[in-house]
Protein backbone atom coordinates (compact mmCIF):
# COMPACT_ATOMS: atom_id res chain seq x y z
CA UNK A 1 0.00 0.00 0.00
CA UNK A 2 1.35 3.42 -0.97
CA UNK A 3 1.13 5.73 2.04
CA UNK A 4 3.60 8.40 0.96
CA UNK A 5 2.96 11.86 -0.44
CA UNK A 6 5.10 14.05 -2.68
CA UNK A 7 5.52 17.66 -1.69
CA UNK A 8 6.79 19.97 -4.42
CA UNK A 9 7.69 23.61 -4.90
CA UNK A 10 4.38 23.89 -6.74
CA UNK A 11 3.98 26.83 -9.13
CA UNK A 12 7.13 28.91 -9.35
CA UNK A 13 8.38 31.81 -11.41
CA UNK A 14 11.88 32.98 -12.23
CA UNK A 15 13.63 35.53 -14.43
CA UNK A 16 14.88 34.81 -17.91
CA UNK A 17 18.64 34.24 -17.70
CA UNK A 18 18.39 33.33 -14.03
CA UNK A 19 18.26 29.99 -12.27
CA UNK A 20 15.68 28.06 -10.32
CA UNK A 21 15.67 25.11 -7.93
CA UNK A 22 13.19 22.32 -8.61
CA UNK A 23 12.49 20.40 -5.41
CA UNK A 24 10.33 17.44 -4.49
CA UNK A 25 10.16 15.73 -1.14
CA UNK A 26 8.69 12.32 -0.36
CA UNK A 27 7.14 12.04 3.09
CA UNK A 28 4.88 9.76 5.16
CA UNK A 29 6.52 6.55 4.01
CA UNK A 30 9.41 4.36 5.13
CA UNK A 31 9.98 3.19 1.56
CA UNK A 32 13.53 3.25 0.23
CA UNK A 33 14.07 5.70 -2.63
CA UNK A 34 16.00 3.82 -5.31
CA UNK A 35 15.89 6.41 -8.08
CA UNK A 36 14.54 9.89 -8.81
CA UNK A 37 13.83 10.95 -12.40
CA UNK A 38 13.39 14.57 -13.46
CA UNK A 39 11.39 15.17 -16.64
CA UNK A 40 10.41 18.17 -18.70
CA UNK A 41 7.00 19.02 -20.18
CA UNK A 42 7.83 17.36 -23.52
CA UNK A 43 8.53 14.01 -21.77
CA UNK A 44 12.29 14.31 -22.13
CA UNK A 45 14.45 13.40 -19.15
CA UNK A 46 16.63 16.11 -17.67
CA UNK A 47 18.36 13.96 -15.08
CA UNK A 48 18.28 10.74 -13.12
CA UNK A 49 19.57 10.33 -9.60
CA UNK A 50 20.20 6.67 -8.82
CA UNK A 51 20.62 6.02 -5.10
CA UNK A 52 23.67 3.82 -5.60
CA UNK A 53 25.24 5.17 -8.77
CA UNK A 54 24.68 8.90 -8.49
CA UNK A 55 23.57 11.51 -11.02
CA UNK A 56 23.13 11.21 -14.76
CA UNK A 57 22.47 14.54 -16.45
CA UNK A 58 21.11 14.11 -19.96
CA UNK A 59 23.46 15.42 -22.67
CA UNK A 60 21.06 18.08 -23.98
CA UNK A 61 20.95 19.68 -20.51
CA UNK A 62 24.56 19.21 -19.38
CA UNK A 63 25.40 22.91 -19.65
CA UNK A 64 22.27 24.16 -17.90
CA UNK A 65 21.36 21.61 -15.26
CA UNK A 66 23.17 21.08 -11.98
CA UNK A 67 22.36 18.24 -9.61
CA UNK A 68 20.96 19.11 -6.22
CA UNK A 69 20.43 20.38 -3.69
CA UNK A 70 19.64 16.93 -2.36
CA UNK A 71 17.42 15.05 -4.78
CA UNK A 72 16.40 18.33 -6.41
CA UNK A 73 17.65 19.95 -9.57
CA UNK A 74 18.96 23.42 -10.39
CA UNK A 75 18.00 24.75 -13.81
CA UNK A 76 20.28 27.56 -14.98
CA UNK A 77 20.39 30.17 -17.78
CA UNK A 78 16.62 30.08 -18.08
CA UNK A 79 14.94 30.84 -21.39
CA UNK A 80 11.29 31.46 -22.18
CA UNK A 81 11.13 27.94 -23.64
CA UNK A 82 11.73 26.53 -20.15
CA UNK A 83 8.23 27.61 -19.14
CA UNK A 84 6.05 24.57 -18.50
CA UNK A 85 5.56 21.50 -16.38
CA UNK A 86 8.33 19.53 -14.69
CA UNK A 87 7.88 16.16 -13.07
CA UNK A 88 9.79 14.34 -10.38
CA UNK A 89 9.28 10.58 -10.31
CA UNK A 90 10.36 8.76 -7.17
CA UNK A 91 10.99 5.05 -7.64
CA UNK A 92 10.74 3.39 -4.25
CA UNK A 93 10.88 -0.05 -2.69
CA UNK A 94 8.53 -1.55 -1.77
CA UNK A 95 5.91 1.13 -2.42
CA UNK A 96 6.44 1.70 -6.14
CA UNK A 97 6.33 5.00 -8.01
CA UNK A 98 5.38 8.46 -6.75
CA UNK A 99 5.13 11.45 -9.06
CA UNK A 100 5.14 15.17 -8.35
CA UNK A 101 4.45 18.15 -10.61
CA UNK A 102 5.98 21.62 -10.68
CA UNK A 103 4.94 24.43 -13.00
CA UNK A 104 7.68 26.88 -13.90
CA UNK A 105 6.94 30.24 -15.47
CA UNK A 106 9.92 32.11 -16.89
CA UNK A 107 9.33 35.85 -16.92
CA UNK A 108 10.87 38.45 -19.22
CA UNK A 109 10.56 41.22 -16.63
CA UNK A 110 13.77 42.18 -14.88
CA UNK A 111 11.76 42.82 -11.73
CA UNK A 112 10.29 39.32 -11.63
CA UNK A 113 11.17 37.71 -8.36
CA UNK A 114 11.71 34.01 -7.87
CA UNK A 115 8.81 32.67 -5.85
CA UNK A 116 8.49 29.20 -4.44
CA UNK A 117 6.31 27.49 -1.94
CA UNK A 118 5.97 23.90 -0.82
CA UNK A 119 2.62 22.39 -1.58
CA UNK A 120 1.05 18.99 -1.97
CA UNK A 121 -0.31 18.70 -5.52
Amino acid sequence: MMTGTIETTGNISAKKGGSVILQCHLSSTMAQVTQVNWEQHDHSLLAIRNAELGWHIYPAFKDRVAPGPGLGLTLQSLTMNDTGEYFCTYHTYPDGTYRGRIFLEVLESSVAEHSARFQIP
Partner: antibody
Protein backbone atom coordinates in the same frame (compact mmCIF):
# COMPACT_ATOMS: atom_id res chain seq x y z
CA UNK B 1 41.07 -0.54 -23.27
CA UNK B 2 38.45 -1.96 -20.90
CA UNK B 3 37.93 -5.71 -21.15
CA UNK B 4 35.65 -8.08 -19.27
CA UNK B 5 36.01 -11.85 -19.33
CA UNK B 6 33.60 -14.39 -17.85
CA UNK B 7 34.73 -17.76 -16.56
CA UNK B 8 33.15 -20.72 -14.79
CA UNK B 9 31.79 -24.22 -15.29
CA UNK B 10 29.77 -24.82 -18.43
CA UNK B 11 27.64 -27.54 -16.84
CA UNK B 12 25.78 -27.39 -13.53
CA UNK B 13 23.44 -29.94 -12.01
CA UNK B 14 19.88 -29.01 -11.03
CA UNK B 15 19.49 -27.79 -7.39
CA UNK B 16 23.18 -26.91 -7.24
CA UNK B 17 24.73 -23.42 -7.31
CA UNK B 18 26.07 -21.71 -10.38
CA UNK B 19 29.22 -19.67 -9.76
CA UNK B 20 30.81 -17.38 -12.36
CA UNK B 21 33.71 -14.93 -12.31
CA UNK B 22 34.14 -11.75 -14.30
CA UNK B 23 37.72 -10.50 -14.59
CA UNK B 24 38.04 -6.84 -15.52
CA UNK B 25 41.16 -5.35 -17.08
CA UNK B 26 41.83 -1.76 -18.05
CA UNK B 27 39.59 -0.22 -15.38
CA UNK B 28 39.29 -0.52 -11.62
CA UNK B 29 35.92 -1.82 -10.47
CA UNK B 30 36.21 0.43 -7.39
CA UNK B 31 36.68 3.62 -9.44
CA UNK B 32 33.17 4.09 -10.76
CA UNK B 33 30.12 2.56 -12.42
CA UNK B 34 28.10 -0.61 -11.87
CA UNK B 35 29.32 -4.09 -12.71
CA UNK B 36 26.51 -6.26 -14.00
CA UNK B 37 25.45 -9.78 -14.78
CA UNK B 38 23.05 -10.26 -17.69
CA UNK B 39 21.94 -13.54 -19.17
CA UNK B 40 20.62 -14.52 -22.57
CA UNK B 41 18.30 -17.46 -22.80
CA UNK B 42 18.04 -19.78 -25.79
CA UNK B 43 15.87 -17.85 -28.22
CA UNK B 44 17.76 -14.60 -27.49
CA UNK B 45 15.78 -13.08 -24.58
CA UNK B 46 18.03 -10.88 -22.42
CA UNK B 47 17.54 -10.57 -18.66
CA UNK B 48 19.34 -8.14 -16.36
CA UNK B 49 20.24 -10.07 -13.21
CA UNK B 50 21.90 -7.51 -10.98
CA UNK B 51 24.99 -5.45 -10.29
CA UNK B 52 27.60 -4.57 -7.74
CA UNK B 53 28.49 -0.89 -7.76
CA UNK B 54 31.93 0.69 -7.47
CA UNK B 55 31.19 1.24 -3.76
CA UNK B 56 30.20 -2.38 -3.20
CA UNK B 57 26.44 -1.92 -2.93
CA UNK B 58 24.29 -4.38 -4.86
CA UNK B 59 21.03 -4.25 -6.78
CA UNK B 60 19.22 -7.37 -7.94
CA UNK B 61 16.38 -8.28 -10.24
CA UNK B 62 13.48 -8.98 -7.83
CA UNK B 63 12.64 -12.17 -9.71
CA UNK B 64 16.03 -13.58 -8.63
CA UNK B 65 16.45 -11.84 -5.28
CA UNK B 66 16.10 -14.97 -3.15
CA UNK B 67 18.68 -16.92 -5.20
CA UNK B 68 21.29 -14.42 -6.35
CA UNK B 69 24.42 -12.98 -4.80
CA UNK B 70 26.98 -10.70 -6.48
CA UNK B 71 30.26 -10.14 -4.69
CA UNK B 72 33.72 -8.91 -5.62
CA UNK B 73 37.44 -9.26 -4.95
CA UNK B 74 38.91 -5.80 -5.36
CA UNK B 75 42.51 -7.04 -5.12
CA UNK B 76 41.98 -9.15 -8.26
CA UNK B 77 39.61 -6.68 -9.94
CA UNK B 78 37.01 -9.43 -10.23
CA UNK B 79 33.34 -9.71 -9.44
CA UNK B 80 31.29 -12.85 -9.03
CA UNK B 81 27.84 -14.27 -9.61
CA UNK B 82 26.34 -16.96 -7.44
CA UNK B 83 22.92 -18.32 -8.37
CA UNK B 84 21.50 -20.92 -6.02
CA UNK B 85 19.03 -23.77 -6.53
CA UNK B 86 19.37 -23.75 -10.30
CA UNK B 87 16.92 -25.47 -12.63
CA UNK B 88 17.00 -26.18 -16.36
CA UNK B 89 15.34 -22.74 -16.79
CA UNK B 90 18.68 -21.17 -15.81
CA UNK B 91 20.36 -22.56 -18.92
CA UNK B 92 21.68 -19.49 -20.72
CA UNK B 93 24.70 -17.54 -21.86
CA UNK B 94 25.88 -15.34 -19.00
CA UNK B 95 27.47 -11.95 -19.67
CA UNK B 96 29.18 -9.51 -17.40
CA UNK B 97 28.96 -5.85 -18.41
CA UNK B 98 29.82 -2.37 -17.22
CA UNK B 99 26.98 0.10 -16.70
CA UNK B 100 28.31 3.60 -17.24
CA UNK B 101 26.58 6.42 -15.38
CA UNK B 102 27.47 8.99 -18.08
CA UNK B 103 25.47 7.05 -20.69
CA UNK B 104 23.18 5.20 -18.29
CA UNK B 105 23.71 2.09 -20.40
CA UNK B 106 25.95 -0.98 -20.67
CA UNK B 107 28.97 0.18 -22.64
CA UNK B 108 31.35 -2.77 -22.27
CA UNK B 109 30.38 -6.45 -22.31
CA UNK B 110 32.29 -9.68 -21.89
CA UNK B 111 32.14 -12.33 -24.60
CA UNK B 112 29.76 -14.45 -22.53
CA UNK B 113 29.96 -17.96 -21.12
CA UNK B 114 27.42 -20.67 -21.89
CA UNK B 115 26.00 -22.52 -18.89
CA UNK B 116 23.84 -25.62 -19.20
CA UNK B 117 21.84 -26.92 -16.26
CA UNK B 118 21.37 -30.63 -16.68
CA UNK B 119 21.67 -33.80 -14.67
CA UNK C 1 7.97 -4.72 -14.56
CA UNK C 2 8.15 -2.48 -17.60
CA UNK C 3 7.75 -4.67 -20.68
CA UNK C 4 9.58 -3.58 -23.83
CA UNK C 5 7.92 -5.00 -26.93
CA UNK C 6 9.64 -5.27 -30.29
CA UNK C 7 6.77 -6.37 -32.47
CA UNK C 8 8.91 -7.53 -35.39
CA UNK C 9 11.07 -10.54 -34.57
CA UNK C 10 12.54 -10.46 -38.08
CA UNK C 11 13.00 -7.73 -40.67
CA UNK C 12 14.34 -8.25 -44.15
CA UNK C 13 16.10 -5.48 -46.01
CA UNK C 14 18.59 -4.83 -48.79
CA UNK C 15 21.96 -3.10 -48.74
CA UNK C 16 21.43 0.65 -49.13
CA UNK C 17 17.86 0.57 -47.82
CA UNK C 18 16.54 2.59 -44.90
CA UNK C 19 15.11 0.44 -42.12
CA UNK C 20 13.33 1.31 -38.88
CA UNK C 21 12.92 -0.98 -35.87
CA UNK C 22 10.26 -0.13 -33.32
CA UNK C 23 10.05 -0.70 -29.59
CA UNK C 24 7.02 -0.04 -27.37
CA UNK C 25 7.17 0.28 -23.58
CA UNK C 26 4.26 -0.98 -21.47
CA UNK C 27 4.33 2.29 -19.55
CA UNK C 28 5.91 5.72 -19.77
CA UNK C 29 9.73 5.58 -19.82
CA UNK C 30 10.40 9.13 -21.02
CA UNK C 31 13.66 9.04 -23.02
CA UNK C 32 15.34 6.38 -20.85
CA UNK C 33 16.01 3.91 -23.66
CA UNK C 34 19.18 2.39 -25.12
CA UNK C 35 19.67 0.30 -28.27
CA UNK C 36 22.15 -2.56 -28.65
CA UNK C 37 23.41 -4.51 -31.64
CA UNK C 38 24.33 -8.19 -31.33
CA UNK C 39 26.09 -9.73 -34.28
CA UNK C 40 26.12 -13.53 -34.66
CA UNK C 41 28.40 -15.16 -32.08
CA UNK C 42 29.17 -11.86 -30.35
CA UNK C 43 28.05 -10.02 -27.25
CA UNK C 44 25.70 -7.02 -27.44
CA UNK C 45 27.25 -3.66 -28.30
CA UNK C 46 25.87 -0.27 -27.25
CA UNK C 47 24.78 1.92 -30.18
CA UNK C 48 22.29 4.48 -28.82
CA UNK C 49 21.69 5.75 -25.28
CA UNK C 50 19.06 7.99 -23.69
CA UNK C 51 16.85 7.57 -26.81
CA UNK C 52 18.60 9.80 -29.37
CA UNK C 53 22.31 9.88 -28.43
CA UNK C 54 24.85 7.96 -30.47
CA UNK C 55 27.54 6.21 -28.46
CA UNK C 56 31.20 6.98 -29.16
CA UNK C 57 32.43 5.59 -32.47
CA UNK C 58 28.98 4.53 -33.71
CA UNK C 59 28.46 5.42 -37.41
CA UNK C 60 25.97 8.23 -38.06
CA UNK C 61 23.76 5.99 -40.18
CA UNK C 62 22.41 4.70 -36.84
CA UNK C 63 19.87 6.96 -35.13
CA UNK C 64 17.38 6.66 -32.30
CA UNK C 65 14.23 8.61 -31.58
CA UNK C 66 11.09 8.61 -29.47
CA UNK C 67 9.86 9.38 -25.98
CA UNK C 68 7.14 8.23 -23.63
CA UNK C 69 6.25 4.74 -24.82
CA UNK C 70 7.19 4.60 -28.51
CA UNK C 71 10.77 4.36 -29.76
CA UNK C 72 12.39 3.89 -33.14
CA UNK C 73 15.86 2.79 -34.14
CA UNK C 74 16.78 3.64 -37.75
CA UNK C 75 19.58 2.63 -40.08
CA UNK C 76 19.59 5.20 -42.89
CA UNK C 77 21.54 3.08 -45.36
CA UNK C 78 21.92 -0.58 -44.43
CA UNK C 79 25.34 -2.17 -44.89
CA UNK C 80 26.08 -5.89 -45.11
CA UNK C 81 27.80 -5.77 -41.72
CA UNK C 82 24.58 -4.57 -40.06
CA UNK C 83 23.21 -8.12 -40.09
CA UNK C 84 22.47 -8.55 -36.39
CA UNK C 85 19.81 -8.66 -33.69
CA UNK C 86 18.86 -5.24 -32.29
CA UNK C 87 17.55 -4.79 -28.75
CA UNK C 88 15.97 -1.89 -26.93
CA UNK C 89 16.41 -1.52 -23.16
CA UNK C 90 14.81 0.81 -20.63
CA UNK C 91 16.45 2.32 -17.54
CA UNK C 92 13.52 4.48 -16.44
CA UNK C 93 13.26 2.51 -13.23
CA UNK C 94 15.75 0.36 -11.36
CA UNK C 95 14.60 -2.94 -12.88
CA UNK C 96 16.24 -2.66 -16.28
CA UNK C 97 14.43 -4.62 -18.98
CA UNK C 98 15.15 -5.48 -22.61
CA UNK C 99 12.99 -5.93 -25.65
CA UNK C 100 12.82 -9.35 -27.27
CA UNK C 101 15.04 -8.34 -30.16
CA UNK C 102 14.59 -7.77 -33.89
CA UNK C 103 16.74 -9.79 -36.24
CA UNK C 104 17.78 -7.83 -39.30
CA UNK C 105 18.29 -10.03 -42.33
CA UNK C 106 19.99 -8.84 -45.50
CA UNK C 107 18.38 -9.96 -48.76
Amino acid sequence: DVQLQESGPGLVKPSQSLSLTCTVTGYSITSDYAWNWIRQFPGNKLEWMGYISYSGSTSYNPSLKSRISITRDTSKNQFFLQLNSVTTEDTATYYCARFMITTFAMDYWGQGTAVTVSS
Amino acid sequence: DIVMTQSHKFMSTSVGDRVSITCKASQHVSTAVAWYQQKPGQSPKLLIYSAPYRYTGVPDRFTGSGSGTDFTFTISSVQAEDLAVYYCQQHYNTLWTFGGGTKLEIK
